[in-house]
Interface confidence: low
């Protein structure tokens, strides 16, 4: 025998105790398929959620988020706070992207700039907190007269390669010397600070700009989870 309830369409429910009839869903409930024995309670879009589509007898209400928030999860089950471009949401709220990362949206996390050198390219436009770097042609392509079709190599002077090599070695040596000098300088300063503390009346107590910047930027510790900040669940 066919179950009479199977004749009940969406928007109704069937109850064998009520003469096996298809009763309309009560207010604030719905059934999206036929043959249901109960109607489901309509979703209510409250607080940070706002109604995008009203509930009807055959379909649930649909919510989205109030301005300043965006949807997360299936069917907008959560609303997450928007941040500005160049920021990401952490447990402590919106934080600027760390140097070397960017976010060009109001949501999501800061992503590292593209490493142009991995593709053998050079940086054409520097990255910012809001924008990724723009990679340009590879450094070799930037030499004067470079074209897609390589012309025959011009005859070079015998000393040319040697000059380039000498210049490269000189620059490298200068850089290394500078690094050694800076390291020594810091070591000497540390030693003086330990030996003669009275010379420094307020030894580095004032928060430096660098420290403030570190606090304001969102470089996450490994234990700090993504998301979870500024989220509202339905």
């Amino acid at each position: 025998l066919q179950d009479p309830c199977s004749n009940c369409p969406a928007g109704t429910f069937c109850d064998n105790n009520r003469n096996q009839i298809c009763s309309p869903c009560p207010p604030n409930s719905f059934s999206s398929a036929g043959g249901q024995r109960t109607c489901d309670i309509c979703r209510q879009c409250k607080g940070v959620f706002r109604t995008r589509k009203e509930c009807s007898s055959t379909s649930n209400a649909e919510c989205d988020c109030t301005p300043g928030f965006h949807c997360l999860g299936a069917g907008c089950s959560m609303c997450e706070q928007d941040c500005k471009q160049g920021q990401e949401l952490t447990k402590k709220g919106c934080k600027d992207c760390c140097f070397g990362t960017f976010n060009d949206q109001k949501r999501g996390i800061c992503r590292p700039w593209t490493n142009c050198s991995l593709d053998g390219k050079s940086v054409l436009v520097n990255g910012t907190k809001e924008r990724d770097v723009v990679c340009g042609p590879s450094p070799a392509d930037l030499s004067p007269g470079a074209s897609s079709v390589t012309p025959p190599a011009p005859a070079r002077e015998p000393g040319h390669s040697l000059q380039v090599l000498t210049l490269f070695l000189a620059l490298t040596s200068a850089l290394l010397l500078a690094l050694i000098f800076i390291t020594l300088l810091f070591s000497v300063l540390k030693w003086i600070r330990k030996k003669f503390p009275h010379i420094f009346k307020q030894p580095f107590k004032k928060t430096t700009g660098a420290a403030q910047e570190e606090d304001a930027c969102s470089c996450r510790c490994p234990q700090e989870e993504e998301g979870g900040g500024g989220g509202y669940e339905l």
């Epitope: 009479p4 004749n7 009940c8 369409p9 928007g11 109704t12 105790n17 009520r18 003469n19 096996q20 009839i21 298809c22 009763s23 309309p24 009560p26 207010p27 009807s56 007898s57 055959t58």
Partner: antibody
Framework: QIQLVQSGPELKKPGETVKISCKAS????????MNWVKQAPGKALKWMGW????????TYADDFKGRFDFSLETSATTAYLQINNLKNEDTATYFC????????????WGQGTLVTVSA | ENVLTQSPAIMSASPGEKVTMTCSAS?????MHWYQQKSSTSPKLWIY???KLASGVPGRFSGSGSGNSYSLTISSMEAEDVATYYC?????????FGGGTKLEIK
């Protein structure tokens, strides 16, 4: 052929009680809700409510709560409408109607019972 | 309560004329049903689920509409169509009928 046969016309005085019957035949009585509809002279149809013939549970529209009673005699496949403490405004034709599973429509109606309330 | 308002309350049409009557619901309904009632008789289901003709209803009748606004149309009026037509909603408690449109012939 499915039939709903109602009792004859009634002439009553204000304050009295009337009980109208609606005898069902040629279908399983307890499978279908029985509804009552009022129609005052020259006026529109007005749904009064219904009785669940399976459980005996009545449901009344707001305007018909208090003096109106729906009841059943399942063995006789008969539904009843009783109106207590009759008033002049109860003068009307009362119809019983079988409600289908779906849609919620009335295909089968009784012939109607005219109740006249007059001093 | 979902109030159904029918218009016009009374109308007359000549044989062969097209007739349209409307029913406006105070709250949106999924379907509208229509009954025909001739004097001193029980109402007859005429159109159900907005546009489906009940058994025995002539093809000149049609129904349409959605949400809050529905209509019944007779493509070509005939003498036997003289009656009062009631719209009816069964989408929620209390079930309600419209005030009726009385159709006369010129």
């Amino acid at each position: 052929q499915i039939q709903l046969v109602q009792s004859g016309p009634e002439l009553k005085k204000p304050g009295e009680t009337v009980k109208i019957s609606c005898k069902a035949s040629k279908f399983t009585f307890t499978n279908y809700g029985m509804n009552w509809v009022k129609q005052a002279p020259g006026k529109a149809l007005k749904w009064m409510g219904w009785i669940n013939t399976y459980t005996g549970e009545p449901t009344y529209a707001d305007d018909f709560k208090g003096r109106f009673d729906f009841s059943l005699e399942t063995s006789a496949t008969t539904a009843y409408l009783q109106i207590n403490n009759l008033k002049n405004e109860d003068t009307a034709t009362y119809f019983c109607a079988r409600r289908e599973y779906y849609p919620w429509v009335f295909v089968y109606w009784g012939q109607g019972t005219l109740v006249t309330v007059s001093a | 309560e979902n109030v159904l308002t029918q218009s016009p309350a009374i109308m007359s049409a000549s044989p062969g004329e097209k007739v349209t009557m409307t029913c406006s619901a105070s709250s949106s309904v999924s379907y509208m049903h229509w009954y025909q009632q001739k004097s001193s008789t029980s109402p007859k289901l005429w159109i159900y689920d907005t546009s489906k003709l009940a058994s025995g209803v002539p093809g000149r009748f049609s129904g349409s509409g959605s949400g809050n606004s529905y209509s019944l149309t007779i493509s070509s009026m005939e003498a036997e169509d003289v009656a009062t037509y009631y719209c009816f909603q069964g989408s929620g408690y209390p079930l309600t009928f419209g005030g009726g449109t009385k159709l006369e012939i010129k």
